[in-house]
């Protein structure tokens, strides 16, 4: 029951300084722009997992702003009308249509920086974001399928005779649970309206030489293991240890 490991190549430039929120960005610095220009334009769509409650910066294609006519950000979120944020260089005006989420803004003035920021990322920000840059040489697109990751809350307890329950509560996507040693297990998933999933794995060990069991939770936000000693007393509970 091994879970897929996070693709760390997508977790670029994530940092945590002082008490500020962690920031994620797929933007390239200026040195990379010229050498990767054609490569970036070919990679029209990027799947991007981002942790909830962090800050995210989404970038337009690396086009020099002096060549620009119009920049448009198109934002399609589940269950909402499409939102567009547009900037016309000639008249220096910005226009927004159906954009109600104040956490999604231009990084700064669009004539200086065309990037979009989400401060902070919420579970409702799952969706598709596309930057369209209109230039005299044609239109250039860059799209992001933003997948908001929610770290599940973990609990492990013994609830009856030689039986332990490991729960990964309200994670996104669903966590995967495995046990050491393997036992006789039943796993249930509970889907919540906000898109998170609670995974509950209950395991029973018939053999008595199993005294300590480990629940391993695999998730895109990181993996954790909890362990517990199986108590001989029916009905007694003992809290888990994390390592």
């Amino acid at each position: 029951e091994g879970a897929a490991q996070p693709n760390n190549s997508l977790m670029l430039q994530t940092s945590k300084e002082n008490h500020a929120l962690a920031s994620s960005s797929l933007c390239m610095d200026e040195k990379q722009i010229t050498q990767n220009y054609s490569k970036v334009l070919a990679e029209v769509n990027t799947s991007w997992p981002v942790k909830m409650a962090t800050n995210a910066v989404l970038c337009c294609p690396p086009i020099a702003l002096r060549n620009l006519i119009i920049i448009t950000w198109e934002i399609i979120l589940r269950g909402q009308p499409s939102c567009t944020k547009a900037y016309r260089k000639e008249t220096n005006e910005t226009k927004e249509t159906n954009c109600t989420d104040e956490r999604i803004t231009w990084v700064s003035r669009p004539d200086q920086n065309s990037d979009l920021q989400i401060r902070p990322v919420a579970i409702t920000h799952d969706g598709y974001y596309r930057c369209i840059m209109v230039t005299p040489d044609g239109n250039f697109h860059r799209g992001y399928h933003l997948q908001v990751l929610v770290t599940p809350e973990l609990t492990l307890f013994q609830n009856r005779n030689r039986t332990a329950v490991c729960k990964a509560v309200a994670g996104k996507p669903a966590a995967q649970i495995s046990w050491i040693p393997e036992g006789d297990c039943a796993t249930k998933q509970e889907y919540w309206s906000n898109g998170t999933v609670t995974v509950k794995s209950t395991c029973h060990w018939e053999v008595h030489n199993v005294s300590t069991v480990t629940c391993h939770v695999s998730h895109l936000t990181g993996n954790k293991s909890l362990y517990i000693e199986l108590l001989p007393v029916p009905g007694a509970k003992k809290s888990a240890k994390l390592y």
Partner: antibody, heavy 120, light 108 residues
Framework: QVQLVQSGAEVKKPGASVKVSCKAS?????????MAWVRQAPGQGLEWMGL????????WYAQKFQGRVTMTRDTSTSTVYMELSSLRSEDTAVYYC????????????WGQGTLVTVSS | EIVLTQSPDFQSVTPKEKVTITCQAS??????LLWYQQKPDQSPKLLIK???TLASGVPSRFSGSGSGTDFTLTINSLEAEDAATYYC??????????FGGGTKVEIK
């Protein structure tokens, strides 16, 4: 073929003991699951008697049968046994064995049943 | 000790009719409930595990629902071959796996 085959019918006198066997075949007789015993008196419902851990030999008996029932296993012959002592007429019933994975696959395989008649 | 109370004890039903049998536990058993069908002179046959999961080979007209203390077995369109006694069983704790009293379903 995956099956549980039980011993034949028995007639016993009150106060005697009876030992019913249940032989597993077609699957591994190893740790991880239990063998349970359930009985059914004529025209009555099902009654859980207890179970034995195949790997550990751990025993769980229903309170009603404590002190009168003994469950054992013989891993070399893939057989479990249920012995009931101090028989009385109300112990007349069909006795079933059943394979039991406690959570993932509970009570998923049953023996054909053994009729035990207690009569003077 | 967890006690399972099954109702009704008896039901006489015409073919194609819907049958509902309930099972109530004296305390919460989460979803650890089984439903069986037993025909005369046969061993019990497992229909549903974990309150709502159909056992392999069981027709889809059978369904189970509930969790905690209240559970239901539904036969959506009764067929003649469904005449039998139906039992619920708790498997919440390895130390006690008691059955409900049974519900006899007869075809009119």
């Amino acid at each position: 073929q995956v099956q549980l085959v039980q011993s034949g019918a028995e007639v016993k006198k009150p106060g005697a003991s009876v030992k019913v066997s249940c032989k597993a075949s077609g699957f591994s007789f190893s740790s991880g699951y239990y063998m349970a015993w359930v009985r059914q008196a004529p025209g009555q419902g099902l009654e859980w008697m207890g179970l034995i851990g195949v790997g550990s030999g751990s025993l769980w008996y229903a309170q009603k049968f404590q002190g009168r029932v003994t469950m054992t296993r013989d891993t070399s012959t893939s057989t479990v046994y249920m012995e009931l002592s101090s028989l009385r007429s109300e112990d007349t019933a069909v006795y079933y064995c059943a394979r039991h994975f406690a959570l993932s696959d509970p009570f998923n395989l049953w023996g054909q049943g053994t009729l035990v008649t207690v009569s003077s | 000790e967890i006690v399972l109370t099954q109702s009704p004890d008896f039901q006489s039903v015409t073919p194609k009719e819907k049958v509902t049998i309930t099972c109530q536990a004296s305390e919460s058993i989460d979803s650890y409930l089984l439903w069986y069908q037993q025909k005369p002179d046969q061993s019990p046959k497992l229909l549903i595990k974990q309150a709502s999961t159909l056992a392999s080979g069981v027709p889809s007209r059978f369904s189970g629902s509930g969790s905690g203390t209240d559970f239901t077995l539904t036969i959506n369109s009764l067929e003649a071959e469904d005449a039998a006694t139906y039992y619920c069983q708790n498997y919440y704790d390895i130390s006690s796996n008691d059955f409900g009293g049974g519900t006899k379903v007869e075809i009119k």
